[in-house]
Interface confidence: medium
């Protein structure tokens, strides 16, 4: 649907993307799956996350942030070895305020790169971007004073994922607009990995029967479940190995006792 970004180079800055498809707008597609993907944003010159619906869309879509950066950012591989001192702000902290398409009135917080502070803004309830936090504290923790962590930069202590308005999850009504809402995720102090690893297994809404794995934060193990092919949440992996690799790293060991809290 979205082809190349319809903008001139002068509007976008001087950087030319490595491939023409890197200039395409993120295209979630007309389907209902919820697949975490990455695209290169011509406006911010960064790779950013979006939710892909599972069909159609375009070539500006990558399974990993790394793959996106390698493909679309000139000279990325040369500069990829960064100084390990201190933590970096996740890319989404630099996104512009985006209230989204819907007409709700939700008090949220965003990181303002001009003032270098977290500030209040009004979120409409759907779409928007990930520079969107439910509490000031959460915003500060992630964008103002990021904590150094061994896990990849863009995956540290993320707040509940702000869903794209296309995802098939719980729904509620805000100001007479029916808005898909992100599933409520329990906040756990002993887990500092990806928040979707805390979500319960969700079979989704379709009729297929696919073998998948989900991370059980209570047992610290990945278990099998049947996925119906669309909807559901991101605690959904095609192999046990991928599941463990993605979620196991977030557990924090209690050093004095040597056990998982």
């Amino acid at each position: 649907l979205s082809e190349e970004a319809d903008d001139t180079d002068s509007e976008l800055g001087s950087m030319k993307p490595l491939h023409t498809f890197c200039a395409m707008k993120a295209d979630d597609g007309p389907c209902k799956a919820m697949i975490r993907s990455y695209f290169f944003n011509m406006y911010t010159h960064q790779c950013e996350e979006f939710i892909y619906g599972g069909c159609e869309g375009n070539e500006n879509r990558f399974d990993t942030l790394e793959e996106c950066k390698k493909t679309c950012i000139p000279g990325y591989e040369k500069t990829a070895v960064k100084a390990a001192s201190g933590a970096e702000r996740p890319d989404f902290c630099f996104l512009e305020e985006d209230p989204g398409l819907c007409r709700g009135y939700m008090k949220r917080y965003l990181y303002n790169n001009q003032t270098k502070q977290c500030e209040r803004f009004v979120y409409g309830g759907c779409l928007g971007n990930r520079n969107n936090f439910e509490t000031l504290d959460e915003c500060k923790k992630i964008c103002e004073n990021p904590v150094h962590s061994p896990s990849p930069v863009n995956e540290v202590q993320m707040s509940d994922y702000v869903t794209d308005g296309n995802t098939v999850t719980d729904r509620s009504t805000v100001n007479n607009i029916v808005v898909p809402q992100s599933p409520k995720v329990p906040r756990r102090r002993d887990y500092r990995g990806r928040p979707w690893c805390l979500q319960p297994a969700d079979s989704g809404l379709c009729k297929a029967s696919e073998r998948r794995f989900y991370y059980n934060s209570a047992t610290g193990k990945c278990h099998r479940f049947n996925y119906t092919g669309c909807g559901g949440n991101n605690n959904n992996f095609t192999t046990r190995r991928r599941c463990l690799r993605s979620c196991k790293t977030g557990l924090i060991k209690n050093k004095s006792k040597g056990v998982v809290k």
Partner: antibody, heavy 117, light 107 residues
């Protein structure tokens, strides 16, 4: 506010040609996919053609493929539909519509094309 | 090709609930959108992405999509809701419309 105004409809003989125009205003025309949708008298909506993105990728319904050509002039904020080898079954009101993501959020009022001898 | 099937007509008494269905093999995986068209007028979107109502559309319009069937529900139907209703989805890169349903408000 967003406005779409179609023109160019009229009476044409079978085998003849006609060019429809859709003048757009109130939005950044080049940033949106644009489509033609038609409606035969007393019948339902039928998607005809799409043009999307700055590369102007084009798509056509099987019923018009090879006979109709969609195009756009972003400098004039205008969408076109060149219709050749017209048939009686092409008789319809032709609407231009703005494609927002995967649905049509704005429609013109339509222009009537009558193919008859 | 995918077909979206709608009942040709639905009748409802004023104040009652009207349900218009749209079935298609692609609907378990694809979103449905709904348009209202009154005689001599262009269509207007009343529901997008299965359940979302654009601003300006009355609260009595709602949508759902489960399995092979998307449904447009009009609760407390009013005389002004009498119109043709079309579902629209997507297939193979292009939009697809249902055949349309004429909603008649009795009395």
């Amino acid at each position: 506010q967003v406005q779409l105004v179609e023109s160019g409809g009229g009476l044409v003989q079978p085998g003849g040609s006609l060019r429809l125009s859709c003048a757009a205003s109130g939005f950044t025309f080049r940033s949106y996919g644009m489509d033609w949708v038609r409606q035969a008298p007393g019948k339902g909506l039928e998607w005809v053609s799409s043009i999307r993105g700055s590369r102007s990728s084009t798509y056509y319904a099987d019923s018009v493929k090879g006979r109709f050509t969609i195009s756009r002039d972003n400098s004039k904020n205008t969408l076109y539909l060149q219709m050749n080898s017209l048939r009686a079954e092409d008789t319809a009101v032709y609407y231009c519509a703005r494609l927002y993501r995967y649905w049509f959020d704005y429609w013109g009022q339509g222009t009537l094309v009558t193919v008859s001898s | 090709d995918i077909e979206l099937t709608q009942p040709p007509s639905v009748s409802v008494a004023p104040g009652q609930t009207a349900r218009i269905s749209c079935s298609g093999d692609n609907l378990p995986n694809y979103y449905a959108h709904w348009y209202q068209q009154k005689p001599g007028q262009a269509p207007v979107v009343v529901i997008f992405y299965d359940v979302n109502r654009p601003s300006g559309i009355p609260e009595r319009f709602s949508g759902s999509n489960s399995g092979n069937t998307a449904t447009l529900t009009i609760s407390g139907t009013q005389a002004e809701d009498e119109a043709d209703y079309y579902c629209q989805s997507w297939w193979d890169g292009v939009p697809v419309f249902g055949g349309g349903t004429k909603l008649t408000v009795l009395g």
